[in-house]
């Protein structure tokens, strides 16, 4: 048995006479032989579920579900209840109604075995019948909505009449009907005004019925019509077996370059017309088991269940359904030497499915794991300026297909043929398994005899000790010009184009910082800034070379605070900035401020912003004072 609603609403007035009928609650059957028996909870509740008083006023007919006033609720009773409502005005009280046989303990009230009946209380006597508007004569203030389980016996789930109105205003005639299309499974009995289902409902055919209830009021010669929505929702049960969309029960996959733990190797989709079990229970009740194979397979793969609600068309309306994606996932990184082919089977069981038929499917995955060979081009040729600063990125080396690699560890090394000309370093980029070549020793660059640098690039997979090698020829170009004395270590410090371009900084391939002119479009990724190389900094990503020293590209790598209009990077740096952004790496601070506008008002605002920043910086104890910044701003 279950209630057709989880909440009912009616009005209560002071001194309404004992015996006044209030409303009917309705229970629907889960099985044909069930007979409902209704029971009221012992207490009345107020605001915030405050228990107000034992219920001495309202009774229920156990067999019919009729609630009625056993005794009149007088003003003094009402004041007593109000006094217990935690100081809130008592506007609404509620009772719990239980369906027997349910637990006799009055605890939480949860549908389907319990419903709440809310009474809106009016501190006046019942109004004169002639003063009631048609809407008040026809329907409760709160519009009802109904829930009916699919595949259950038909039954009565609503009664239209407002019983207190009928009882206290017998001279007013009220008639009801349901507007519904042809062939809908509901009827409204003209005499009893009871609404019932004609037959068992099927949620997979239709899930929602948006009916309209029509009420016609006759008072003397006057006739008025009131219409309200009358929505019915069909509740699901697990009556559909899982199936394969288009009959596809097998997926084939090749594991080659993507060998990282958690890589999705292949996916098979299962369709279920049901939307139960509910999401909280789904993974527990809708099980998937990788059928036992060899130990290697069990250790290497796992199956992940990803259910998703979808909607499908049925009889011209959309109903919800579930698609279950079963992903075959790598449980560990695979060695590049691994080479095998296997068939895996996954048993899917919709354990709540009651039949007919079986709620079990078998999924098949055919997987080939191919070995990966390390290959480098026969040689690389690059050039570097004698003026390049330390950490300047001058190129990349990459084993064949390295951009496609994941879960494959490749370490790059440089072996120099001339010990005194060992200028470059290499670091492996975690993103694409390439090796970034950078200037590590600027002194060697200046030596006249180091005009050509010869290296051997060695790429190694340490897990298998597999290697690849290539020659690297680096031509050193240009004349050495001494670093400018008095210039900052970091290009990012400079806030104006002229001062940016007159200095070099860490990471600069040309020995000069580069100015990136922003687009001036508010808080933008393309903010103006001074960079060692606009190819790599800022690009919203703190790369493996930039991590070596915060002075290279604080715009991408700073973990400190950013003052002014900006969007922080994830997990660090400036994702987007307003105007010009400059940074003081040792202060762990960046400032994003409007481009220079010769406007006194703006100037004052900027000044205020700087003052705020200055407090943030800790006053005179820090490297940057407000005046420094302010005058710098106008330089």
């Amino acid at each position: 048995l279950y209630f057709s609603r989880d909440a009912y609403w009616e009005k209560l007035y002071v001194d309404q006479p004992a015996g006044t009928p209030l409303l009917y609650v309705h229970a629907l059957r889960d099985a044909p032989e069930e007979v409902p028996s209704f029971r009221l909870g012992q207490h009345l509740y107020g605001t915030y579920r405050t228990r107000l008083h034992e219920n001495n006023w309202i009774c229920i007919q156990e067999d019919t579900g009729l609630l009625y006033l056993n005794r009149s609720l007088d003003r003094s009773s009402w004041e007593k209840l109000s006094g217990r409502n935690r100081g809130f005005p008592l506007l609404t009280v509620y009772l719990k109604v239980f369906l027997s046989p349910t637990s006799l303990r009055e605890g939480e009230c949860q549908w389907p075995g319990c419903a709440r009946v809310y009474f809106s209380f009016f501190n006046t006597s019942f109004p004169a019948c002639t003063s009631l508007k048609p809407r008040e004569l026809c329907f409760p203030e709160t519009r009802p909505s109904f829930r009916i389980r699919e595949n259950r016996p038909p039954g009565t789930f609503h009664q239209f009449r407002l019983l207190p109105v009928q009882f206290l205003c017998p001279n007013i005639s009220v008639a009801y009907r349901l507007l519904e299309g042809e062939g809908l499974p509901f009827r409204c009995a003209p005499d009893s005004l009871e609404v019932s289902t004609r037959w068992a409902l099927d949620r997979e055919q239709r899930e929602k019925y948006e009916l309209v209830a029509v009420c016609t009021v006759h008072a003397g010669a006057r006739e008025e019509v009131v219409m309200v929505p009358f929505p019915v929702t069909v509740y699901d049960e697990d009556d559909s077996a899982p199936t394969f969309p288009a009959g596809v029960d097998t997926a084939s996959a090749v594991v080659e370059f993507k060998r990282k733990e958690d890589t999705v190797v292949a996916t098979l989709r299962v369709f279920d017309a049901d939307v139960v079990p509910a999401s909280g229970e789904l993974v527990r009740r809708y099980t998937s088991t990788l059928l036992p194979g060899d130990t290697w397979t069990q250790q290497t793969f796992r199956v992940e269940h990803w259910p998703n609600e979808t909607s499908v068309q049925a009889n011209g309306s959309f109903v919800r359904a579930t698609v279950h994606d079963y992903r075959l996932v790598l449980n560990r990184n695979l060695s590049i030497s691994e080479n095998r082919t296997m068939q895996l089977a996954v048993l899917v069981n919709d354990s709540d499915f009651q039949g007919p038929g079986a709620g079990v499917l078998l999924l098949h995955f055919n997987v080939s794991v191919l070995p990966v060979s390390l290959h480098l081009p026969s040689s690389y040729s690059l050039s570097v300026s004698r003026r390049a600063r330390r950490f300047a990125q001058i190129g990349k080396v990459c084993v064949e297909n390295c951009q496609a690699f994941s879960g494959i560890n490749v370490q790059y090394e440089l072996h120099s043929s001339g010990a005194n000309c060992s200028t470059l370093g290499v670091v492996t980029s975690a993103e694409d398994t390439s090796g970034i070549l950078f200037v590590n020793d600027t002194k060697a660059l200046r030596r006249p005899k180091c005009a050509e640098l010869h290296y051997m690039v060695v790429a190694t997979n340490h897990q298998t000790s597999r290697q690849a090698q290539a020659q690297l020829l680096v031509t050193v170009e240009g004349l050495y010009v001494a670093e400018e004395a008095g210039c900052p270590l970091s290009c990012a410090v400079s806030k104006r184009r002229p001062e940016c371009e007159e200095c070099g900084g860490l990471g600069s391939p040309t020995g000069r910082c580069e100015w990136r002119q922003g687009d001036g479009k508010g808080i933008t990724r393309n903010f103006s800034t001074c960079s060692p190389s606009t190819k790599t900094c800022p690009d919203g990503h703190c790369d493996v070379v930039e991590t070596q020293d915060i002075n290279i590209c604080p715009q991408d790598c700073l973990r400190g605070s950013i003052v002014g209009g900006h969007e922080p990077g994830e997990p660090r740096g400036i994702k987007a900035g307003y105007g010009t952004c400059n940074c003081f790496p040792e202060e762990e601070k960046c400032f994003c401020e409007p481009e220079d506008i010769q406007d006194p008002l703006c100037d004052e605002l900027c000044r205020e912003q700087k003052l705020i920043s200055e407090e943030d910086l800790g006053g005179e104890q820090k490297l940057i004072s407000e005046e420094d910044l302010h005058h710098h701003h106008h330089h």
Epitope: A482, E484, G486, L489, S490, V493, K495, R496, P498, H632
Partner: antibody, heavy 121, light 107 residues
Framework: QVQLVQSRDEVKKPGASVKVSCKAS????????ISWVRQAPGQGLEWMGW????????NYAQKVQDRVIMTTDTSTSTAYMELRSLRSDDTAVYFC??????????????WGQGTMVTVSS | DIQMTQSPSSLSASVGDRVTITCRAS??????LAWYQQKPGKVPKLLIY???TLQSGVPSRFSGSGSGTDFTLTISSLQPEDVATYYC?????????FGQGTKVEIK
């Protein structure tokens, strides 16, 4: 607070060497270079040279370049200026000075307190 | 090397007077000129950098102007505490030469 603290005054004989230290505090030592400036009694300021505290690169004034060596010890945030083959006209107050990294080239806004080196037989 | 020449080498003025010191570079140095104040027995103090930008904490009666080869330091209203020697310095490239200094006294 940003400051440069120099070693105590020295008295040296002609032909000897002197090594003056300059300890930086309140900032990251490698973020800006240190210059050395001297001032003979009653005379003006004379720039002697500059060291890049990050990589050790140096630039020396022509007048002293054969006799001066500027070095740093980043572990102690200290810069050193060694002047060899001292003569009586090397008697002066020796200052270390730095420019805060506020973008572009900068003048000296931080100075050590000075070290008096007297060369006398 | 670029030479820096200051004039006058000394001057005497009354409190409240407007004082002007000039500095000439033997070749163009753009705006890379600084002015320092040194009081007797004290450390030099930066007043102006980039030819015209007032250093933080320096009174606004000090101002700088010029670009290229000719530069000026002006004290709009001389105060007793301004008695000192003033030096210009170029810093566009090494060597960072100083001028020979201008000694300012109160009449």
């Amino acid at each position: 607070q940003v400051q440069l603290v120099q070693s105590r005054d020295e008295v040296k004989k002609p032909g000897a060497s002197v090594k003056v230290s300059c300890k930086a505090s309140g900032y990251t030592f490698t973020t800006y270079g240190i210059s050395w400036v001297r001032q003979a009694p009653g005379q003006g300021l004379e720039w002697m040279g500059w060291i890049n505290t990050y990589n050790g690169d140096t630039n020396y004034a022509q007048k002293v370049q054969d006799r001066v060596i500027m070095t740093t010890d980043t572990s102690t945030s200290t810069a050193y200026m060694e002047l060899r083959s001292l003569r009586s006209d090397d008697t002066a107050v020796y200052f270390c000075a730095g420019a805060r990294p506020l973008g572009g080239r900068r003048a000296f806004d931080i100075w050590g307190q000075g070290t008096m080196v007297t060369v006398s037989s | 090397d670029i030479q820096m020449t200051q004039s006058p080498s000394s001057l005497s003025a009354s409190v409240g007077d407007r004082v002007t010191i000039t500095c000439r570079a033997s070749q163009g140095i753009s705006h890379y000129l600084a002015w320092y104040q040194q009081k007797p027995g004290k450390v030099p103090k930066l007043l102006i950098y980039a030819a015209s930008t007032l250093q933080s904490g320096v009174p606004s009666r000090f101002s700088g102007s010029g670009s290229g080869t000719d530069f000026t330091l002006t004290i709009s209203s001389l105060q007793p505490e301004d008695v000192a020697t003033y030096y210009c310095q170029k810093y566009n490239s090494v060597p960072w030469t100083f001028g020979q200094g201008t000694k300012v006294e109160i009449k």
